[in-house]
């Protein structure tokens, strides 16, 4: 009967999200049937979060509203093995928006998220950021460097990262 | 896609009160984190208060603490900013704004993570 309404439940959510996600893959999180975590399909899953490589060209303000329409935000990267799991599913021939961003152009950068910015816990290509004008952060790929940030005028149209929380159901 | 249409503003005397209220329509309102914004002339637009999409979860920007508060009636499809001893300083344009969210407890406090924006109400505090 406890199986039976958590079900009825999780059927039901199902339904209400498929609006925004027609599809959601879920895994049973550790020894507890009760707990299932999703992510929309085909987004990819690191650790508690989701993510989707939007291929669509855009500017940083309508790539961050293209990511809040699906319930996510911009990349936050806030670890190394996090940027490494996500440049899998990068190509080398593009530039990623992140959720970084310098909005006064006086190197305060900062999270979309408001994640406290940790220079020490960041990834930018030698030489970067160069420009007080380039108020916006991408990730792409230099031989030299491998992947690494750099920053670019917000407005020159780039694919992006979306991330959020997996969904619980 | 929501549509958000604030309401209640208007002129008072310092001390005062107001309500403001936005109503949404379109999507499942209960789907959806919400929040209020205020541009006082030739400023940037602030935070002033947000709540998750069960109401279980606030959040109040220092300088309005313990004077407005922030309220949702989902079977209504509406937040509310009640706005207690207002002082001139809160004269603003406020908007309310629209974020969808899985997740019950969220709430969000930076501008550009709101999807949709109502186009605001005026509340002027003078005597």
């Known amino acids: 009967n406890f199986m039976y309404s958590k079900t009825v439940k999780r059927l039901s959510k199902l339904r209400e999200y498929q609006q925004y996600h027609p599809s959601l893959t879920c895994v049973m999180e550790g020894k507890d049937i009760e707990d299932w975590s999703c992510c929309p399909t085909p987004w990819t899953s690191f650790q508690s979060s989701c993510y989707f490589i939007s291929t669509g060209m855009q500017s940083w303000t309508k790539s961050q509203k293209n990511c809040s329409v699906m319930g996510a935000d911009l990349v936050v990267i806030n670890t190394r093995e996090e940027q490494d799991f996500i440049i899998q599913n990068l190509k080398r021939n593009s530039s990623y928006f992140l959720g970084l961003s310098d909005p006064g152009g006086r190197r305060h950068w900062q999270w979309v998220d408001q994640t406290p910015y940790n220079e020490n816990v960041t990834f930018w290509h030698s030489g970067e950021p160069n420009n007080l004008d380039e108020r916006c952060a991408i990730i792409n790929f230099r031989s030299s460097e491998e992947w690494g940030w750099n920053d670019i005028h917000c407005h020159v149209p780039q694919k992006s990262i979306c991330k959020m929380k997996k969904i619980y159901i | 896609q929501v549509q958000l249409q604030e309401s209640g503003g208007g002129l008072v005397q310092p001390g005062g009160s107001l309500r403001l209220s936005c109503a949404a329509s379109?999507?499942?309102?209960?789907?959806?984190?919400m929040g209020w914004f205020r541009q006082a002339p030739g400023k940037a637009r602030e935070f002033v208060a947000a709540i998750s999409r069960s109401a279980g979860s606030t959040y109040h920007v220092d300088s309005v603490k313990g004077r407005f508060t922030i309220s949702r009636d989902n079977a209504m499809n509406t937040v509310y900013l009640q706005m207690n001893s207002l002082q001139p300083e809160d004269t603003a344009h406020y908007y309310c704004?629209?974020?969808?969210?899985?997740?019950?407890?969220?709430?969000?406090?930076?501008?550009?993570?709101?999807?949709?924006w109502g186009q605001g109400t005026q509340v002027t505090v003078s005597s």
């Open positions: 379109g999507d499942t309102f209960s789907n959806y984190a």
């Open positions: 704004a629209a974020r969808l969210t899985f997740n019950l407890i969220d709430y969000y406090t930076a501008e550009t993570r709101y999807t949709y």
